[in-house]
Structures are given as C-alpha cells and as structure tokens.
C-alpha cells in the first residue's frame, strides 16, 4: 500500500470507559492533527476506516461492525459502543484515505470495571470549588451526544457510595449538582448516573469526578514573606556556612503561577561566581494555599559574601513582594589573655 502519514500512538488521549456502558469515541485526527473537519473530508471523497489491535496482541484487525444489536457502529467520525465489553480494550486506529491521500492515528482505549461504590482505576477529573463562596455547581461531564434533546434522562447523584438526598448544602438539580456553601467536608468523589432509553433498551452512563474545596479568591492576598524578616540577623564568621531560608505563603489562586527566587547584589544566583546552592520545598494547606521555602546556602562564606545584599522575591497573580535578609559579619570575641590584658597595662 502507498505511504500513509502515521501520527503514531496518541498516548495523550488515553481513553477510559466503563464496562457495559455506551461509549462514543471521536476520531482524534479531526480534533488534534488535521486542519479540516470530517464533513470537509467526506465531501472531498475521503473515507474514514477504523481498525484495532487487541490488548497484548500485535495484529491489526478490522473492527466487526456486524455484531448483534449493532453493538459497535460508526457514525460520521464517531466510533460507538452500545455497550462496551471488557475485551474491547486495545489500541484503535482511525485512517482517513482515498487513492492519493492517507493519514492515520492510533489511540489506546481501556474498558474498566467499577464496583458498586463506583470505585475503579478510572482517572478522575478534579473540579475545584471555592470555600464559602456562595452557590457553585458541577455538571455531569461528557454526556453530550449520547441521546437526542427529545430524550429526558433520569440523573442520580452520589457522594462516594451514598445517594445525594436531603444533604445539608448539596442539591441535585438534574445534570447539575449545586453546592450552597462549599466546605472542606464537601471534598470527595461525586458520581452522576445518567439513565436513558434507546431502541427499547436502557443504557447507563456513569461519570465520577473529584471535588476539591480550595481557598476563595475573596480571601486571597498577595504573597507573604515570613522569612527573611526584620527580627532575624544572619551573623556569621568567614568560613562558616550561611543558610538563609526564604519562606513565602501564597493564597490559593486558580491558574496562578507562584514564584520564589533569590537575588544576590541584584543578580540571580546563576549569574554570579560565588558557590551558592538553593533547595526548595513546597507544602500545601487543606485549601491548597501554598508555602514555598527556598534555602540559600553558601558552604564557606567569605567576608566579601557577608557584605552582599541577599533579597528574597515572590510573585503570584496577586502581586510581587521582596524582603532583604539582614546579613552581617560576626565581630570576633576578644581573646582575654592578650587583648584584655593589654587594656590593663600588661606587657
């Protein structure tokens, strides 16, 4: 066969679906690799072909679209399972071709099992809710396109294993779940089960997501440098190790990049000749506020180093701050026998 543009195995799109549930999988070519959509390709006389490689096999084989009740079918650029089976797991390829053009991509599909409490190896999306922020909603994800708008499904929401009914601050509202005032106690896994009829059969879609309650932007502050501060002086003798921690508190801010860095005499440590190491550690509070500590270390400090300016800087979406460390050279204690004795007139 003639050459085909092979985009390889697209592991970025590791698709996971539940066993015994419908699944609709769009060919990734049109979403991520080609600059035209399926309709354009179809109009231009291109054909979309599907095949797969079973788990632990090397042999590519065509997909059987003649299974009872059309269990697997294709509609435009979508591969349908009604429903999936465990042994549908494998690498699926969609290929777009005609006599002069060919492009294909493969992607892994994993059919996973769940228990009666919806626990499974499925990677769960995380939805962040602001603590004590007023009404916030989560929506049952990835259910578009499974049934027409004329079909009215039933939706049941669960927190962990428990059906959500008569919860204090969590109210199911169809495809949405409303949190009146989100609290830390609302952290957990939430599952919506969507049940709908199709051609005399009943299908279930199970979608689980993790809710994480985070700090509210209403309470967010610019970075706060706890150390260095005015109360601590780093007094060292030449030859000693100088250790200065820069400890910064960052409020949680959605999509904010928190940065901490040192400057020595106005330059980044990488841009100066002295032997400096910087070690960073990060810790988080329950609401994902962040404390970053960068310890600046000079193993054998010189008297020149003790005259330098050491400034800790921090930046977030809320602002930028800087604090200088108070560094000075320790005045050596007088040696009694010589220096004090001289004061008493001894020779």
């Amino acid at each position: 066969s003639e050459r085909c543009d092979d985009w390889g195995l697209d592991t970025m799109r590791q698709i996971q679906v539940f066993e015994d549930e419908p699944a609709r999988i769009k060919c990734p070519l049109f979403e991520h690799f080609l600059k035209f959509n399926y309709s354009t390709a179809h109009s231009a006389g291109l054909t979309l072909i599907w095949y797969w490689t079973r788990q632990d096999r090397d042999l590519e084989e065509p997909i059987n679209f003649r299974l009872p009740e059309n269990r697997i079918s294709k509609e435009k650029d979508v591969l349908w399972f009604r429903p999936t089976l465990l042994n549908d797991t494998g690498n699926y390829t969609c290929m777009l071709r005609n006599t002069t053009y060919c492009s294909k991509v493969a992607f892994p599909l994993e059919v996973v099992q769940k228990d009666s409490c919806f626990n499974s190896p499925m990677k769960l999306p995380v939805h962040k809710l602001y603590i004590e922020y007023g009404i916030q909603r989560i929506t049952c994800p990835n259910v578009d396109g499974y049934f027409p708008s004329s079909v009215k499904p039933t939706i049941t929401w669960y927190m962990g294993c428990y059906k959500i009914q008569n919860f204090n601050n969590v109210i199911p509202e169809g495809m949405n779940l409303s949190f009146l005032i989100a609290l830390i106690s609302n952290n957990g896994n939430y599952t919506c089960v969507v049940t709908y009829p199709e051609n005399g059969r009943t299908f279930h879609l199970t979608r689980t997501l993790t809710v994480k309650v985070v700090g509210s932007p209403k309470n967010a502050v610019p970075p706060v440098i706890h150390s260095p501060n005015d109360h601590v002086v780093y007094e060292k003798e030449p030859g000693e190790e100088l250790l200065i921690p820069c400890t910064v508190y960052f409020s949680f801010l959605m999509d904010s990049r928190n940065e901490v860095w040192w400057t020595i005499d106005g330059k980044k440590p990488d841009d100066i000749t002295i032997d400096v190491t910087i070690n960073e550690s990060i810790s988080h509070s329950r609401t994902e506020d962040e404390t970053r500590t960068q310890i600046l270390s000079i193993k054998k400090v010189t008297s020149e180093d003790l005259k330098r300016s050491y400034v800790c800087h921090a930046r977030s979406a809320k602002g930028e701050v800087a604090k200088a460390a108070k560094v000075k050279q320790k005045v050596p204690a007088p040696r009694y026998t010589v220096e004090l004795a001289c004061g008493f007139g001894a020779t």
Epitope: Y133, G134, P217, K218, V221, P222, V224, Y249, K318, G319
Partner: antibody, heavy 118, light 112 residues
Framework: EVQLVQSGAEVKKPGESLKISCKGS????????IGWVRQMPGKGLEWMGI????????RYSPSFQGQVTISADKSVNTAYLQWISLKASDTAIYYC???????????WGQGTTVTVSS | DIVMTQSPLSLPVTPGEPASISCRSS???????????LDWYLQKPGQSPQLLIY???NRASGVPDRFSGSGSGTDFTLKISRVEAEDVGLYYC?????????FGQGTRVEIK
C-alpha cells in the same frame, strides 16, 4: 491602566434618592472587592462596605447597614452606592476603591462629592 | 467592632528627619496564615487616599523605600526614614481582620 472612574458631583435635597457609580477598567472587575469609603467635610475616612462583583456578595459596616445599598453590574464593570432618602448628614465625599487582597485598597476613584441641602 | 487608635493625631516634622506614627488595634490583627491584616494609607491635600503599606509591612507598588511598616498583633508603626515636603497629609491605618474593616482616626503630618 487600572482605574476606577466615579460619577460626577451631586446636589440633592433631603428625602431625595441617589445612586452614584464607580466604573472599573484595565483589570478583571469580577475578581476583586470594591469598597466604598465616606469622608465627611474636615473629617477622617470611614469604611462603609464592600462588594464582590463576581457574585454580588456584599458586606456592610454596622454604621451603614440599612442606610445605603451597595450593588454591582458586572456586565458594565460598575459598582453603585445608593440612598433611598438622603439626609443633610450624608453630605460628604464618597470614594470607591479596589481591594487587591487582604484589605489593600490599591486603586481609588477620584471621589464623588454629594451635597444634601434644603 | 475592632477599634483602631492612632497616635499622635498631629505630627510636625522637619524635612530630612525621621518620623513615626503608631497604630493600636483593640484586638490582634494576626491572621491564622501568619500575616497581619493592617494597611497604611496617605491622603495628600485635595487628593484621593493612596495605599502605602499592606499586610503590615509590605510596601505598595511605587511607594518610596523611605516608608516602612512594622509590628504584629495589636501594635503597628509606620516609619518615614527621612521626611520630604511631599509627604505631608493625613495618614490612616486600617484593619481588615474581619469583613468589618475600620480606619484609625488619622494622623496629620505637617512641616514645622
């Protein structure tokens, strides 16, 4: 440029209603508190209240609760301070200010002078 | 309500000399996250107030480094290392521990 532009000076009679405005620009209006501050002639600053335009969460100073209404319209990036029935003692300069975090009112409007006199 | 008390209420200063304003709150302003919810503002004659210091000790953008804030809990100080003529005006501290913010009564700084 981040700025807050307030509506112009007002001269009113006691008992009349009034709504003054504060329009934000150059930043995400829904992501910062907007506060209102009163300064009576020759006096100091008094904090009246704040609003979070994102969801209209409003907090008032006990001294101003029930006396004024703070509101916001995020579609036009504008906060409002409203009186139903003005009194002579409402004569003052009213400032709006953006709080950048914690309290930190880092951007202030130019002030709106309200004069209430019969 | 948290009451903020400033002293002195009037501060005559000599250009080039240091100056210091004290602010005391009726309860601790130390937040559980380790910062103090206290700001300092300056209102120059005929102007809107401007932020000088936030969270107790952080200089606001564009504020000269002769201004510094210190203190924790209930006692705070604003220092001007060398007063300049343009520093005259009313200085206010403001607390924001609760969402009932309150200003101090103000300190008038004027040139001797």
């Amino acid at each position: 440029e981040v700025q807050l532009v307030q509506s112009g000076a007002e001269v009113k009679k006691p008992g009349e209603s009034l709504k003054i405005s504060c329009k934000g620009s150059g930043y995400s209006f829904t992501s910062y508190w907007i506060g209102w501050v009163r300064q009576m002639p020759g006096k100091g600053l008094e904090w009246m209240g704040i609003i979070w335009p994102g969801d209209s969460d409003t907090r008032y100073s006990p001294s101003f609760q029930g006396q004024v209404t703070i509101s916001a319209d995020k579609s036009v990036n504008t906060a409002y301070l409203q009186w139903i029935s003005l009194k002579a003692s409402d004569t003052a300069i009213y400032y709006c200010a953006r709080s950048s975090g914690g309290t930190a009112m880092d951007v202030w409007g130019q002030g709106t002078t309200v004069t209430v006199s019969s | 309500d948290i009451v903020m008390t400033q002293s002195p209420l009037s501060l005559p200063v000599t250009p080039g000399e240091p100056a210091s304003i004290s602010c005391r709150s009726s309860q601790s302003l130390l937040h559980s996250n380790g910062y103090n919810t206290l700001d300092w503002y300056l209102q120059k004659p005929g102007q809107s107030p401007q932020l000088l210091i936030y969270l107790g000790s952080n200089r606001a953008s564009g504020v000269p480094d002769r201004f510094s804030g210190s203190g924790s809990g209930t006692d705070f100080t604003l220092k001007i290392s060398r007063v300049e003529a343009e520093d005259v005006g009313l200085y206010y501290c403001m607390q924001g521990l609760q969402t009932q913010w309150t200003f101090g009564q103000g300190t008038r700084v004027e040139i001797k």
